[in-house]
């Protein structure tokens, strides 16, 4: 094959080599960029900056090598469009520093920075940590800071990420209230801070106020949906990023729903309960307290992390005709109580009749659901019976 006269020449099926002295000052308009998986650049003294726009369209790039060139600055977001990048060799350039943000979000198996005039500062604390933890092949490079000795020896006692404290209201929060949160940020070299509110959706009207070092957030007209939702304060400095999440507990009264009994490895009377704080539960069977045992007990399903409602079953492992009847679930918290009842029939009575049992003459409709604000026993809905004396 004839030698390639261009600044950059194909290498293998999806590679590109750019080694002609001084031919590049940026990476714009590289041929076949969208399919490249490997890019090798050498001897490009005019290539001094690597920025977001330089690597746009290189979405398949896995290996990037820029060596023996004039690179002195890599933007924190330079690799935003190359999420598959796994090997990055920037050795023998003019880099004094490299932001932690540059490699954040990448799964780098290899990062080579040897031969650069690195300047030891807190901004390289992340790289020192990689060296300590044996990441990316960094320890083998024995990185040096220009005129300052090994990177490993850099003092780091003062190199911390920001410290965050989020103040939430002590008092009980009710539906419709306005809630003020404040995030206090401390630390050196603070760069940016803010709130992450992606979980909130329709839970409240949001108003942000203030800036570093004290950020305010007002959640106006809160709803019960705010419960279990994370409100996150974040801040960044040259060392890294810190986040603190809090949740606001919005009080609301207990509610309960019962559903028709289903056979699920024995029997289950499904229920849903809601309320903040979480309500206490009590079962009644035909109006009397039902004591739970290993064969009749409440079992909750795994709760969803972001909601207060709990789903579960009253498990009846071996119900017979004696378990047929009216089941009531009572739920209560300091803000209210609720009940729901359902008729369940698991098995027909195998005996024609027992002289000591009442003979049912009329029943409430099967699977009657009732939900009310208070547990109420409705006397007119209970089945009545006729006792028969047998001589």
């Amino acid at each position: 094959a004839a030698p390639c006269p261009d600044a950059c020449c194909p290498h293998g099926s999806s590679g590109l080599r750019c080694t002609r002295d001084g031919a590049l000052d940026s990476l714009h308009h590289l041929p076949g960029a969208e399919n490249l998986t490997e890019l090798y650049i050498e001897n490009q003294q005019h290539l001094q900056h690597l920025e977001l726009r330089d690597l746009r369209g290189l979405g398949e790039l896995r290996n990037l090598t820029i060596v023996k060139s004039g690179l002195r600055f890599v933007a924190p977001d330079a690799f935003h469009f190359t999420p598959r990048l796994s090997r990055l060799n920037l050795s023998f350039n003019a880099l004094e520093s490299l932001s932690w943000k540059t490699v954040q979000g990448l799964s780098l198996q290899e990062l080579v920075l040897s031969g650069n005039p690195l300047h030891c500062s807190c901004a390289l604390r992340w790289l020192q940590r990689w060296e300590e933890e044996g990441l990316g092949g960094v320890p083998e490079q024995k990185l040096q800071c220009h005129g300052q000795g090994p990177l490993a020896h850099m003092p780091n006692a003062s190199c911390g990420v920001p410290t965050l404290k989020v103040q939430v209201p002590n008092a009980s929060v009710d539906v419709g209230d306005d809630v003020l949160l404040r995030c206090q940020v401390e630390g050196r070299g603070l760069e940016q801070a803010g709130w992450i509110l992606t979980e909130l959706e329709q839970s409240a009207t949001v108003m942000k106020s203030g800036g570093l070092p004290s950020l305010g957030l007002t959640l106006a007209n809160v709803t019960s949906d705010l419960n279990r939702k994370n409100v996150t304060c974040w801040a960044e400095n040259d060392v890294g990023r810190a986040e603190v999440s809090v949740q606001v507990n919005v009080s609301f009264p207990a509610s309960v729903q019962l559903h028709t009994a289903v056979e699920m490895h024995h029997w289950c009377i499904p229920f849903s309960v809601d309320g903040q704080p979480a309500p206490s539960l009590r079962w009644l069977f035909n109006g009397s307290v039902l004591n739970e045992t290993s064969f009749i007990f409440t079992e909750f399903l795994e709760p969803a992390a972001n909601e207060t409602v709990r789903h579960g079953c009253l498990r009846l492992n071996q119900p017979t005709h004696v378990n047929n009847g009216n089941y009531t679930l009572l739920a209560a918290n300091p803000f209210g109580q609720a009940s729901a009842s359902i008729m369940a029939a698991f098995m027909d009575n195998p005996f024609e009749f027992n002289p000591e049992d009442p003979i049912p003459v009329s029943f409430s409709p099967v699977d009657t659901n009732s939900t009310s604000g208070d547990p109420v026993e409705k006397k007119d809905e209970t089945p009545f019976g006729v006792s028969v004396a047998v001589g």
Epitope: T293, F295, R315, Q318, M347
Partner: antibody, heavy 117, light 106 residues
Framework: QVQLVQSGAEVKKPGASVKVSCKSS????????MHWVRQAPGQGLEWMGE????????NYNEKFKNRVTMTVDISISTAYMELSRLRSDDTAVYYC??????????WGQGTTVTVSS | DVQLTQSPSSLSASVGDRVTITCSAS?????MHWYQQKPGKAPKRLIY???KLASGVPSRFSGSGSGTDYTLTISSLQPEDFATYFC?????????FGQGTRLEIK
């Protein structure tokens, strides 16, 4: 696989107390009831009570109600049965057994408690 | 308490025999469960919910019954079946066991 491993044999004096442990592995401890059953030498099986680690609910056999205490430590998936004011007729092998939807699916290997002056 | 009475209390039989053990409850129970115990060992679940075989239990074992009367049957005794058998109710507190039936080699 599911394992219930009980503490070792105990020799106690009348009037003393004994605490037997049952360490669970191979399943979600809080999802199953734990039963305690004892068997005196040459005798049948006697149910002492049950505990639900999920909420600490206990049901005791009336016969032992004033002398037995069942507890759990969910952080180490372990159930305990303490029997106080021991008498010579408490000499027995004490078993733990777990149940969820079916009775006593798996049993511990048993702990021999001897009460003798 | 629900009393469970097993009969016979002990029985001698030979390999290949068909054996039936009964368990009578003092009041109606929905289901009966059966356990096998060998000397020095913990009981092992044999049959649950009256007629369901526990995992790994050979099909020569079967259970039946309802109300107050239940039966455990071994269709053709094998040497490893010589043990003590207990019935158990799981319908009311306290849970109770039968006094046991000791099955010996004739």
């Amino acid at each position: 696989q599911v394992q219930l491993v009980q503490s070792g044999a105990e020799v106690k004096k009348p009037g003393a107390s004994v605490k037997v442990s049952c360490k669970s592995s191979g399943y979600t401890f809080t999802n199953y009831w734990m039963h305690w059953v004892r068997q005196a030498p040459g005798q049948g099986l006697e149910w002492m009570g049950e505990i639900y680690p999920n909420n600490g609910r206990v049901n005791y056999n009336e016969k032992f109600k004033n002398r037995v205490t069942m507890t759990v430590d969910i952080s180490i998936s372990t159930a305990y049965m303490e029997l106080s004011r021991l008498r010579s007729d408490d000499t027995a092998v004490y078993y733990c057994a777990r149940s969820r939807y079916d009775p006593m699916e798996d049993w511990g290997q048993g702990t021999t408690v001897t009460v003798s002056s | 308490d629900v009393q469970l009475t097993q009969s016979p209390s002990s029985l001698s039989a030979s390999v290949g025999d068909r054996v039936t053990i009964t368990c009578s409850a003092s009041s109606s129970v929905g289901y009966m469960h059966w356990y096998q115990q060998k000397p020095g060992k913990a009981p092992k679940r044999l049959i649950y919910d009256t007629s369901k075989l526990a995992s790994g239990v050979p099909s020569r074992f079967s259970g039946s019954g309802s109300g107050t009367d239940y039966t455990l049957t071994i269709s053709s005794l094998q040497p490893e079946d010589f043990a003590t058998y207990f019935c158990q109710q799981w319908s009311s507190i306290p849970l109770t066991f039968g006094q046991g039936t000791r099955l010996e080699i004739k």
